[in-house]
């Protein structure tokens, strides 16, 4: 067991004349926070797999307001480290994703809005107990500087946190078969501690926290005898000794649920029932409290003052789900007249009107282009006594004054969440789906329904949305 620690040193515009404006403004103050997701680096898991080693959310940084005319400086950061506890051995090679989020604190209806500013990723080799490793990465026009390390929690030691050390019971030497713990020569290697509840008679371990079964026994704690009396509908290969088929590996074998979650098989895969304070496909996200800001889209978090008590998100109008992550489709009421396109922006409904119509609900007929200006490089197009603005890329609205919302068309399928991103949009897929737009179901054997043609983005990767 141990802790992965991440220290963010700075987040700001990259060098060069094309540096971005500050993400905050006098009209729209904001603050930053960070999320880190860790996975074992050499695993065969797909890119959209959950954060199997753990995930953490930082506190919010100080509120920042842009100084007019001044270039964007490095932005004020949250205090402290991001810490991701790991229960088992440190894998040595790991993958990370670090996201920088902006929380806008303007007067939005329904509270603050969140948007993803930048995301960096990498795979690194790192020994537990080693010094801080530093990194500098660019994401779009932004530059992120950070350090990270993995450290073991006593009594674990070693580069993988798999050796256990305890103070000596006798001053002169360690017990039979146990060596001194270098570099802690005054401590001794301790016998391995198997997974809690592992059967002392039928189970054993070669790594701390595991439970391997002796022949004839099965189950996560080696407490289930392998049946030889009935050979009906077994799963695995035939056993030469009994003439019966013994159970082969099932989706719950080895218990994929972390943090004490219980596993139950489903027709397609498995399902984890997580204890309070944990969630995620494998109960891998731990200790979430209201301080971690689990409620999206301005949801109000109540309860959950400590990791052992559950939190509840009270969602603003237009959002639902346990974390207010799902948008309610208010466009189904067809509020836009004259063929206008309805956009549900969460905090408001917006109608994108057809040529020749205007107004909040496209209720007004328009004159032609006379005296009509289109902002941000848009051009006015006449036709049949009506006008419209043909807007430059990235802008929309009647006069091209509005920044186009790449998420407005709700491009993420199967309940995927859409985030505005520096280069377009990002889809965060619901469990069981993958693909740039969450369009592909993930098959239980790990294969996907992706076509054989070159695959597009994995979920969560940025891409332009044109």
């Amino acid at each position: 067991a141990g802790v992965f620690e991440l220290q963010i040193h700075s987040f700001g515009p990259g060098p060069g004349p094309g540096a971005p404006r500050s993400p905050c403004s006098a009209r729209l103050p904001c603050r930053l926070f960070f999320r880190v997701c860790l996975k074992p680096g050499l695993s065969e898991e797909a890119a959209e797999s959950p954060c199997a080693l753990g995930a953490a959310l930082s506190a919010r940084g100080p509120v920042y307001t842009e100084q007019p005319g001044a270039p964007a400086p490095d932005l004020p950061l949250p205090d402290g480290l991001l810490q991701v506890p790991f229960r088992d051995a440190w894998p040595g090679t790991f993958s990370f994703i670090i996201e920088t989020w902006r929380e806008e604190l303007g007067d939005q209806i329904g509270g603050p809005a969140w948007s993803l500013l930048a995301r960096v990723a990498g795979r690194r080799r790192l020994a537990a107990g080693g010094p801080w490793a530093r990194d500098i990465q660019r994401a779009g026009a932004w530059e992120l500087r950070f350090s990270y390390r993995a450290r073991c929690e006593p009594p674990a030691v070693g580069t993988a946190c798999t050796r256990l050390c305890r103070p000596r019971s006798a001053p002169s030497r360690c017990g039979p078969g146990l060596r001194p713990c270098a570099p802690l020569e005054d401590e001794c290697e301790a016998p391995l501690v198997c997974r809690a509840g592992c059967s002392p008679e039928h189970g054993f371990c070669e790594q701390p926290g595991e439970c391997r079964c002796l022949e004839g026994w099965t189950g996560p704690l080696c407490t289930v005898p392998v049946s030889t009396s009935s050979c009906l509908s077994p799963r695995g290969p035939s056993s030469a000794t009994t003439g019966c088929l013994v159970p082969g590996p099932g989706p719950c074998d080895g218990n994929p649920c972390a943090n004490g979650g219980s596993c139950s098989e489903t027709p397609r895969s498995f399902e984890c029932t997580c204890p309070r304070g944990f969630y995620g496909l494998r109960c891998e996200v731990s200790g979430v409290t209201c301080a971690d800001g689990p409620c999206f889209n301005g949801g109000l978090c109540v309860g959950g003052a400590d990791p052992d008590s559950a939190y509840i998100c009270h969602c603003p109008p237009g959002f639902q789900g346990s974390n207010c992550e799902k948008r309610v489709d208010r466009c189904s009421l067809q509020p836009c007249r004259n063929g206008g396109l309805c956009l549900d922006l969460g905090h408001a409904l917006r109608c994108r009107c057809r040529a020749g119509f205007a107004g909040p609900r496209c209720e007004h007929d328009l004159d032609d282009c006379a005296g009509r200006a289109c902002a941000n490089g848009g051009t006015c197009v006449e036709g049949g006594g009506a006008h419209r603005c043909s807007c430059a890329l990235g802008f929309g609205g009647r006069d091209c004054r509005e920044r186009a919302d790449p998420c407005a068309a709700r491009p993420c399928a199967h309940g995927g969440r859409c985030y505005a991103h520096f280069s377009g949009l990002v889809c965060a897929c619901a469990p069981g789906y993958m693909g740039a737009r969450c369009e592909f179901p993930v098959h239980p054997d790990g294969a996907s329904a992706l076509p054989a043609a070159p695959p597009g983005l994995r979920p969560g990767d940025p891409q332009r949305y044109l």
Epitope: G122, R123, R134, I136, P462
Partner: antibody
């Protein structure tokens, strides 16, 4: 403006060492890493390693681990790359480049190293 | 180490043409891919980083796209100064690795 200026061409015998310098200017020297990349005649690019001028931490490609040394002199904003036990296949143009882990944004003009008996 | 396969290895085109060069990674590298341009006797020059971000000072006719394992560099309208060799580079894993290069020649 940012500039990386490298030392001149070198001709070495097999088994010898070569030390190439890279002088940085136009930015805060300790703010970015300096990477070394080489290119054999008519070939592609091969990353050798980098030095963090702030901490003097170095990381090398496995292929060069035992033969390469990278150092820096903050007083002159210069980084040095020394390659020992030279062999004929080390004949290449050696470039220094400024950057982080996912970008090399400015490159030196290159130093040709010829290893010949 | 992660391998990058560039295609084509060489390409003939005319001024004004639209040109596409592809780079395929041996495994998922998310969007950690950069593109460099190199002219004979010169150092490489950064064009695109993190798959689709245009480096300062690089003309907008250059664009990058893709993520995961498949990436593309597009030059929308070739100019005489664009004839050079182009390399892709992954920066997801250490060591960073480069593609074999695509030589773009005048037809």
């Amino acid at each position: 403006q940012v500039q990386l200026v490298q030392s001149g061409a070198e001709v070495k015998k097999p088994g010898a060492s070569v030390k190439v310098s890279c002088k940085a200017s136009g930015y805060t020297f300790t703010r970015y890493w300096i990477h070394w990349i080489r290119q054999a005649p008519g070939q592609g690019l091969e990353w050798m390693g980098y030095i963090n001028p702030t901490t003097v931490y170095t990381e090398f490609h496995q292929n060069f681990k035992d033969r390469v040394t990278m150092t820096r002199d903050t007083s002159t904003s210069t980084v040095y790359m020394e390659l020992s036990s030279l062999r004929s296949e080390d004949t290449a143009v050696y470039y220094c480049a400024r950057g982080g882990s996912n970008f090399f944004d400015y490159w030196g003009q290159g130093t040709t190293v010829t290893v010949s008996s | 180490a992660i391998q990058l396969t560039q295609s084509p290895s060489s390409l003939s085109a005319s001024v004004g043409d639209r040109v596409t060069i592809t780079c395929r990674a041996s495994e998922n590298i998310y969007y950690n891919l950069a593109w460099y341009q190199q002219k004979p006797g010169k150092a490489p020059k950064l064009l695109i980083y993190t798959a689709n971000s245009l480096e300062d000072g690089v003309p907008s006719r250059f664009s990058g796209s893709g993520s995961g394992t498949d990436f593309t560099l597009t030059i929308s309208s070739l100019q005489p100064e664009d004839f050079a060799t182009y390399f892709c580079k992954q920066a997801y894993d250490v060591p960073p690795t480069f593609g074999g290069g695509t030589k773009l020649e005048i037809k």
